[in-house]
Amino acid sequence: ALDTNYCFSSTEKNCCVRQLYIDFRKDLGWKWIHEPKGYHANFCLGPCPYIWSLDTQYSKVLALYNQHNPGASAAPCCVPQALEPLPIVYYVGRKPKVEQLSNMIVRSCKCS
Amino acid sequence: ALDTNYCFSSTEKNCCVRQLYIDFRKDLGWKWIHEPKGYHANFCLGPCPYIWSLDTQYSKVLALYNQHNPGASAAPCCVPQALEPLPIVYYVGRKPKVEQLSNMIVRSCKCS
């Protein structure tokens, strides 16, 4: 699987999950989140050659098409597969509120 | 929705489904399929700017990150959303066999 265990410990050039830290205030303009100040969101990057973690029948066909037509702009793209939630703390008035934000952290990628 | 109805009738530059015809023999090297000779597979293409048909919480965050950090390589990617099957006919010996190939045709796209 193209997950953090594999991708973070290798120098994989093809589609893989990459490290990305997002600072809520600086990168998103969100000043109201108290904790955490930011988080390891990660992102997916890298080419999707034929047979590389292809998602559907269609992406297999498209990767093969791309192999036969190297100049074509039609090619599978490296996108998130497994996403995880992130708990945050913010204040509603003086009272802290804990909220679980779904689908915020990329754990693995796929070619789609 | 970024579907064939909208995308094929517009000059949309952002993520949208585009027309692509795949010839089984020429583009994939598959000589064994009897009918059809090829099909309109389509593909997804175009940038994924802030708020453009974003798939998950994560893709919204990433698009916003990208807006604040225009030079970053982390950005959502335009990929298939709705896929449709394709019926094919091939021969097993002298006997024709009809098979439904799932997830072969792109009907709409999303930013993931």
């Epitope: 998103l28 303009g29 109201w32 008035g93 003086r94 | 802030y50 708020i51 919480q57 919204k60 916003l64």
Partner: antibody, heavy 121, light 111 residues
């Protein structure tokens, strides 16, 4: 420049629902909380609740809990407020207003023009 | 809920007068060195307009004749020299506790 443009006036019967829209422009819609405030004829201001468009997080005034739903469509930068089981005392001008961004509950620096909702049989 | 009591509920004044409006909260609205108190102006048929945020900060574009002060439970909005366009209703608002609440308003009329 920042603008919040609300939908037009509505007349509803008691027991019905109303959905008011607020289209934002001139700023990053997903970076600020959107509040809804109402004002009955000749009365003061009453905060109904708020939503953070990027995440869909909401905080509602308990007084409206169960009757109000706030949603957004980030693709069109539009916020919506739906109020159900309308009563005659829900007759008011409904405003959307952007929070200034330091906290969830905050001062509100930009306001829509208001939408008059009249509840009458 | 925090109750916000404004006084007076209405007042008559002349152009050039110094006008003071007070707002008292039912409990302190201070937190970490900030006073979570704001002031708005509203003219008939119009939406409220933010004047002062966090007790004493003047909103961008608001004339300097408007000022705010106070802490804890007692706050004041002052108009140093009343102008014709200042005749309106003024509201205080707290955001220290959920739900966010407003004062009942002070109507400033022409004498």
């Amino acid at each position: 420049q920042v603008q919040l443009v609300q939908s037009g006036a509505e007349v509803k019967k008691p027991g019905a629902s109303v959905k008011v829209s607020c289209k934002a422009s001139g700023y990053t819609f997903t970076s600020y909380w959107m509040n809804w405030v109402r004002q009955a004829p000749g009365q003061g201001l009453e905060w109904m609740g708020q939503i953070f468009p990027a995440l869909g997080s909401t905080n509602y005034n308990e007084m409206f809990e169960g009757r109000v739903t706030m949603t957004t469509d980030t693709s069109t930068s539009t916020a919506y407020m739906e109020l159900r089981s309308l009563r005659s005392d829900d007759t008011a001008v409904y405003y959307c207003a952007r929070g200034i961004g330091n906290y969830a509950l905050d001062a509100m620096d930009y306001w829509g023009q208001g939408t008059l909702v009249t509840v009458s049989s | 809920d925090i109750q916000m009591t404004q006084s007076p509920s209405s007042l008559s004044a002349s152009v050039g007068d110094r006008v003071t409006i007070t707002c008292r909260a039912s409990e302190s609205v201070d937190w970490y060195g900030n006073s979570f108190m704001h002031w708005y102006q509203q003219k008939p048929g119009k939406a409220p307009k933010l004047l002062i945020y966090y007790a004493s900060n003047l909103e961008s574009g608001v004339p300097s004749r408007f000022s705010g002060s106070g802490s804890g439970t007692d706050f004041t909005l002052t108009i140093s020299s009343l102008q014709p366009e200042d005749f309106a209703t003024y509201y205080c608002q707290q955001n220290a506790e959920d739900p966010l609440t407003f004062g009942g308003g002070t109507k400033v009329e022409i004498k």
